[in-house]
Interface confidence: medium
């Protein structure tokens, strides 16, 4: 795995590996993993990565399937880093309100909201 | 506040109230609030609502500014409900992989990724 692979390229490669190894990954017919029931994925990163951990412990390792899980761990690392940046900088109320307005704007236009 | 106001309408109304009360909210020049340094807002909901709490405790209440904070608390309730739904249903690996693929696809196309 090239270290300095940009996260965007890492995500693309992981999507490809996921398709490649799908048959192997679904081999366990009895395994049940928590799956979020909505499409606001970012709210569920913790559960998604817990599920990946469960899946990894059930999967025959080796070769590129190991690379798939390694990639997923690097993506987790990236997201953990992003989460750390949520509260790192203290700024004026003005800037907080800009961010809040942006957040609500995104919620208004992009979230899949079921009442 | 009508209880059964759809969340989407609630978000729209809150955006309008935020604009209306902006001058009042930024009155405190010394207050500093943690502001996320990236645009993946959903990762930062906890910090955003902590900031709202800080702001509310510093703001003179009454009239429609009170309604703004009430709306924000309803939005928080909605998001908390969504977070609960992240791990509620246990499903087959197949369905988990669909969700994971969707998550990575969204990351690939919609996230603002800085390497």
């Amino acid at each position: 795995i090239p270290t300095e692979i940009p996260t965007s390229a890492l995500v693309k490669e992981t999507l490809a590996l996921l398709s490649t190894h799908r048959t192997l990954l679904i081999a366990n017919e009895t395994l049940r993993i928590p799956v979020p029931v909505h499409k606001n994925h970012q709210l569920c990163t913790e559960e998604i990565f817990q599920g990946i951990g469960t899946l990894e412990s059930q999967t025959v390792q080796g070769g590129t399937v190991e690379r798939l899980f390694k990639n997923l761990s690097l993506i987790k690392k990236y997201i953990d880093g992003q989460k750390k940046k949520c509260g790192e900088e203290r700024r004026r109320v003005n800037q907080f309100l800009d961010y809040l307005q942006e957040f609500l704007g995104v919620m208004n236009t992009e979230w899949i909201i079921e009442s | 506040i009508p209880t059964e106001i759809p969340t989407s309408a609630l978000v729209k109304e809150t955006l309008a109230l935020l604009s209306t009360h902006r001058t009042l909210l930024i009155a405190n020049e010394t207050l500093r609030i943690p502001v996320p340094v990236h645009k993946n807002h959903q990762l930062c909901t906890e910090e955003i609502f902590q900031g709202i709490g800080t702001l509310e405790s510093q703001t003179v209440q009454g009239g429609t500014v009170e309604r703004l904070f009430k709306n924000l608390s309803l939005i928080k309730k909605y998001i908390d409900g969504q977070k609960k739904k992240c791990g509620e249903e246990r499903r087959r690996v197949n369905q988990f992989l669909d969700y994971l693929q969707e998550f990575l696809g969204v990351m690939n196309t919609e996230w603002i990724i800085e390497s």
């Epitope: 300095e4 951990g53 412990s57 059930q58 390792q61 080796g62 190991e66 761990s73 690097l74 987790k76 | -």
Partner: antibody
């Protein structure tokens, strides 16, 4: 309390095989991948490979690939490492170790080690 | 394979001293490094993982830092019970590899 308890010391002749056991307790055996690491007298640590007690999958270090086999018996929460065609350079302490988490390839609990001596 | 070059190979210090050990990876490995302490006749003990995270129950005088290829392990104030050999390990990809060790002695 998490524990990995290994089998006792072994003395083997060159060309023979040795099978070291590692009994896990204090956690769900199938939830954690088990790695094997060896240490020759006065030397550093050398990773031999890992074994997934849940799926039965393994990945061996190329240096051992043709001689090592890792297995398990889930009914008694025990992992095994068998090394065949032993030579004097295989004289070492063999450790089993538990990987800390799926996204961290480090070892939080280790067995006490099994001394294997290869001598004619 | 990724080589982990650890230095120094041995080190003598006094109680209370600040001790630093470095590890250089042959290629970039993000922050996928752990540090272990091994006392004679015992199994290694995990002190630091993910370059800087302190393992539960490990005294705060132990710390780690670094990313990419350069990693540092520090004991802020050496205690008599810290006499041991210390190893770095990369967890970035298999085969997992260790540094050759640093033997720490009291002056």
């Amino acid at each position: 309390e998490v524990q990995l308890v290994q089998s006792g010391a072994e003395v083997k002749k060159p060309g023979a095989s040795v099978k070291v056991s590692c009994k896990a307790s204090g956690y769900t055996f199938t939830d954690y991948i088990i790695h094997w690491v060896r240490q020759a007298p006065g030397q550093g640590l050398e990773w031999m490979g890992y074994f997934n007690p849940n799926s039965g999958g393994s990945n061996y270090n190329e240096n051992f690939k043709r001689r090592v086999t890792m297995t398990r018996d889930t009914s008694i929460s025990t992992a095994y490492m068998e090394l065949s065609r032993l030579r004097s350079e295989d004289t070492a302490v063999y450790y089993c170790a538990r990987r800390i988490a799926w996204d961290h390839w480090y070892f939080d609990f280790w067995g006490q080690g099994t001394m294997v001596t290869v001598s004619s | 394979d990724i080589q982990m070059t650890q230095s120094p190979s041995s080190l003598s210090a006094s109680v209370g001293d600040r001790v630093t050990i470095t590890c250089l990876a042959s290629e970039g490995i993000s922050n996928d490094v752990a540090w272990y302490q091994q006392k004679p006749g015992k199994a290694p003990k995990l002190l630091i993982y993910a370059a800087s995270r302190l393992q539960d129950g490990v005294p705060s005088r132990f710390s780690g830092s670094g990313s990419g290829t350069d990693f540092t392990f520090t004991i802020s104030s050496l205690q008599p019970e810290d006499i041991a050999t210390y190893y770095c390990q990369q967890g970035y990809k298999t085969p997992l590899t260790f540094g050759q060790g640093t033997k720490l002695e009291i002056k």
